[in-house]
């Protein structure tokens, strides 16, 4: 129904008026990943607290088994941050050696799932090379944007390295999606 | 009042109708920061331009002492840009004197405050090691993400450092929200 | 006319009502980049794919040579990644010469042009040194924020090195923006 | 009101060293860098380094390297800065300031004048 | 080392003149660059930083402007305590470093 069909004419309403808070959106916050079984040559996905602290599911949205699940078609922003930790990255290793250096690199992934297709769509990646010289460093790697999702769609993060993950604070380490 | 009170009861609307340009917004830059007195262990909070050249604040979002004052509960999504310059971090230093090797780092923090609340809610943050070994460097931090907030919460930024903030240009530090 | 002549009067509603699905929306992605004549003294701005893959505008906002048009004054939320990609920044090669070192750096602004103005408007910017020790490095910038523009306004990104754009995913560079 | 308060002027020989001290008050004295500037007497102004109070790292311009110490004692809120084999073109006026690592400097000592005569 | 130059080393002028006072740095710095006021036997005190922002209780006569290499700082009009020594300072990189100073004088 046009939403002109109850307002005046010349208000510029070209689809169905639709209250904010209705929306399907979510925050989910970081929590300590478990060795799992992930397939070979795709990185591995974060699970998520999606209830306790700062994170929420509302109006639909729903997550389940390491994916948001879209419950309505339209354009969503979709963001994410990943803190990395690690130690001494291999790149001072091999440069100590003198070998030819293939930097060590972090990398985070939001992907999307559409049952109806067999590859999974890479939405956003941020990827970053690691050489630092001091023995310990972290950072966050943050993605941000806007997607035309189909309802039924799964979004996930994958990571390139699930052990270098910060999962020790929700304010971290987070994912989460809102429809426009 | 649900607007299907109001509307064609197929439209899916379970909120009062609103319209977007009445919702509350701000976005705030860079000022010089001067040495002031801060709380002992816990990061200093940046202050903030609310008017001038790039920055506002509408529909009752008010800025005062630091703070951003959300006038109404609701979804809203918050974001943050630090960029910080520095020279020759300790990192360096450490290492030339070969002592074990704990880096510089850089931290911004999105902090909510809540007067019913004895202790402030982080809500995002970035911190990075910082171990460049160049003499001069410099780096932005950026934050975003939703979060749900009340009337009369208070939004504001600490960094780990408030000396190394670039306050130069307006584009390179800055602090907003908007209702969702 | 203020929504409240057609909804109930307690509902807080100061200006049209509006239905999202209606609003100037886009994403591009990165494409490879041909060499262009570009101002000097000015970053030269990327080119942009706006229908294949994941990109889009919609409702009258459109692209053409690298600019984004704005066909609606209000508030934008503008945001931008671009991934960059180098081999042994200068910057070590100066350390290692024992010069006073000035690092290389790989900076992204979002710029606004009104046809009205003389000079264009820097929005946003991300600015990082770059000095790595490794052969290889890369890195994104991210940027993000929200903007009052005009009708007819015109955004772009501008980089510090167009030769350094990773131009190999969508995913990894891109531009959007879309009116709240 | 921001203040820094400098130790009394000194009179060192040749060989010697000198041990200046600033006192801050009126912010967080952790939050800013220390930087150390002299003045030799009739001439201008030269930077010689700051220190963080907050970790007490250290930022020596080459000329001083090995001369110089910079350290702090965040418990008084006091920053030192120590030359050593003092020479007569040591005489100067030696001054702290604080402000950021790469910044002006908005509040200075009242300075302290170190003489090197043998 | 980035070098600061200043000129003139002297000028003379009178109460109610305007003065100009140059500084160029030996290489970009951006905006990185603040102009110090400094009287016989005191500190010096912060005028201008970033290039053109003025300090908050220093009087608006005083004005700063450029960018790069090529810096200024202006008295529009001169008052009686504006004769010091002014300094320039660049704070792009390290080492920091001043210029070699500005006395205006009473003519």
């Known amino acids: 129904l046009k939403g002109q069909e109850f307002a005046p004419s010349h208000q510029q309403v070209y689809a169905p008026l639709r209250a904010d808070g209705d929306k399907p959106r979510a925050h989910l916050t970081v929590v300590r990943q478990t060795p799992t079984q992930h397939f070979k040559n795709q990185f591995p996905a974060l699970h998520w607290e999606h209830e306790l602290g700062l994170a929420f599911t509302k109006n639909r949205m729903n997550y389940t088994n390491k994916f948001l699940l879209i419950p309505e078609s339209g354009d969503y922003f979709i963001y994410s941050q990943v803190t990395f930790r690690g130690m001494t990255s291999e790149c001072s290793e091999i440069r100590r050696a003198g070998r030819p250096n293939k930097p060590d690199s972090i990398t985070v992934v939001i992907t999307k799932v559409t049952d109806s297709y067999p590859e999974p769509t890479q939405l956003l990646m941020g990827t970053k090379s690691v050489c630092e010289v001091g023995s310990n460093w972290f950072q966050p790697i943050y993605l941000g944007a806007m997607f035309s999702l189909q309802e039924g769609d799964k979004l996930m993060v994958n990571v390139s390295d699930i052990s270098l993950v910060d999962y020790t604070k929700e304010d971290k380490t987070f994912f989460g999606a809102f429809l426009l | 009042l649900k607007g299907q009170e109001f509307a064609p009861s197929h439209q899916q609307v379970y909120a009062p109708l609103r319209a977007d340009g009445d919702k509350p917004r701000a976005h705030l830059t860079v000022v010089r920061q001067t040495p002031t007195q801060h709380f002992k262990n816990q990061f200093p909070a940046l202050h903030w331009e609310h008017e001038l050249g790039l920055a506002f604040t509408k529909n009752r979002m008010n800025y005062t002492n630091k703070f951003l004052l959300i006038p109404e509960s609701g979804d809203y999504f918050i974001y943050s840009q630090v960029t910080f310059r520095g020279m020759t971090s300790e990192c360096s230093e450490i290492r030339r004197a070969g002592r074990p090797n704990k880096p510089d780092s850089i931290t911004v923090v999105i902090t909510k405050v809540t007067d019913s609340y004895p202790e402030p809610t982080q809500l995002l943050m970035g911190t990075k090691s910082v171990c460049e070994v160049g003499s001069n460097w410099f780096q932005p931090i950026y934050l975003g993400a939703m979060f749900s907030l009340q009337e009369g919460d208070k939004l504001m930024v600490n960094v780990s450092d408030i000396s190394l903030v670039d306050y130069t240009k307006e584009d390179k530090t800055f602090f907003g929200a908007f209702l969702l | 006319l203020k929504g409240q002549e057609f909804a109930p009067s307690h509902q807080q509603v100061y200006a049209p009502l509006r239905a999202d699905g209606d609003k100037p929306r886009a994403h591009l992605t990165v494409v490879r980049q041909t060499p262009t004549q570009h101002f000097k003294n000015q970053f030269p701005a990327l080119h942009w794919e706006h229908e294949l893959g994941l990109a889009f505008t919609k409702n009258r906002m459109n692209y053409t040579n690298k600019f984004l048009l704005i066909p609606e004054s209000g508030d934008y939320f503008i945001y931008s990644q671009v991934t960059f990609r180098g081999m042994t920044s200068e910057c070590s090669e100066i350390r290692r010469a024992g010069r006073p070192n000035k690092p290389d750096s790989i900076t992204v602004v979002i710029t606004k042009v009104t046809d009205s103005y003389p000079e264009p408007t820097q929005l946003l910017m991300g600015t990082k040194s770059v000095c790595e020790v490794g052969s290889n490095w890369f890195q994104p910038i991210y940027l993000g924020a929200m903007f009052s523009l005009q009708e007819g306004d015109k955004l772009m990104v501008n980089v510090s090195d167009i030769s350094l754009v990773d131009y190999t995913k969508e995913d990894k560079t891109f531009f959007g923006a879309f009116l709240l | 009101q921001v203040q820094l308060v400098q130790s009394g002027a000194e009179v060192k020989k040749p060989g010697a060293s000198v041990k200046v001290s600033c006192k801050a008050s009126?912010?967080?004295?952790?939050?800013?860098?220390m930087h150390w500037v002299r003045q030799a007497p009739g001439q201008g102004l030269e930077w010689m380094g700051w220190?963080?109070?907050?970790?007490?790292?250290?930022n020596y311009v080459q000329k001083f390297q090995g001369r110089v110490t910079m350290t702090r004692d965040t418990s008084i809120n006091t920053a030192y800065m120590e030359l050593n084999n003092l020479k007569s073109d040591d005489t100067a006026v030696y001054y702290c300031?604080?402000?950021?690592?790469?910044?002006?400097?908005?509040?200075w000592g009242q300075g302290t004048m170190v003489t090197v005569s043998s | 080392d980035i070098q600061m130059t200043q000129s003139p080393s002297s000028v003379s002028a009178s109460v109610g003149g305007r003065v100009t006072i140059t500084c160029r740095a030996s290489?970009?710095?951006?905006?990185?660059l603040a102009w110090y006021q400094q009287k016989p036997g005191k500190a010096p005190n912060l005028l201008i930083y970033?290039?053109?922002s003025l300090q908050s209780g220093v009087p608006s006569r005083f004005s700063g402007s450029g960018s790069g290499t090529d810096f200024t700082l202006t008295i529009s009009s001169l008052q009686p305590e504006d004769f010091a020594t002014y300094y320039c300072?660049?704070?792009?990189?390290?080492?920091?470093?001043f210029g070699g100073g500005t006395k205006v004088e009473i003519k």
């Open positions: 220190i963080k109070p907050k970790s007490g790292g250290t």
């Open positions: 290489q970009d710095i951006s905006i990185w």
């Open positions: 970033a290039a053109s």
């Open positions: 300072q660049q704070a792009d990189s390290f080492p920091l470093t």
């Open positions: 009126g912010y967080t004295f952790t939050g800013y860098y």
């Open positions: 300031a604080t402000g950021g690592s790469q910044d002006a400097s908005d509040f």
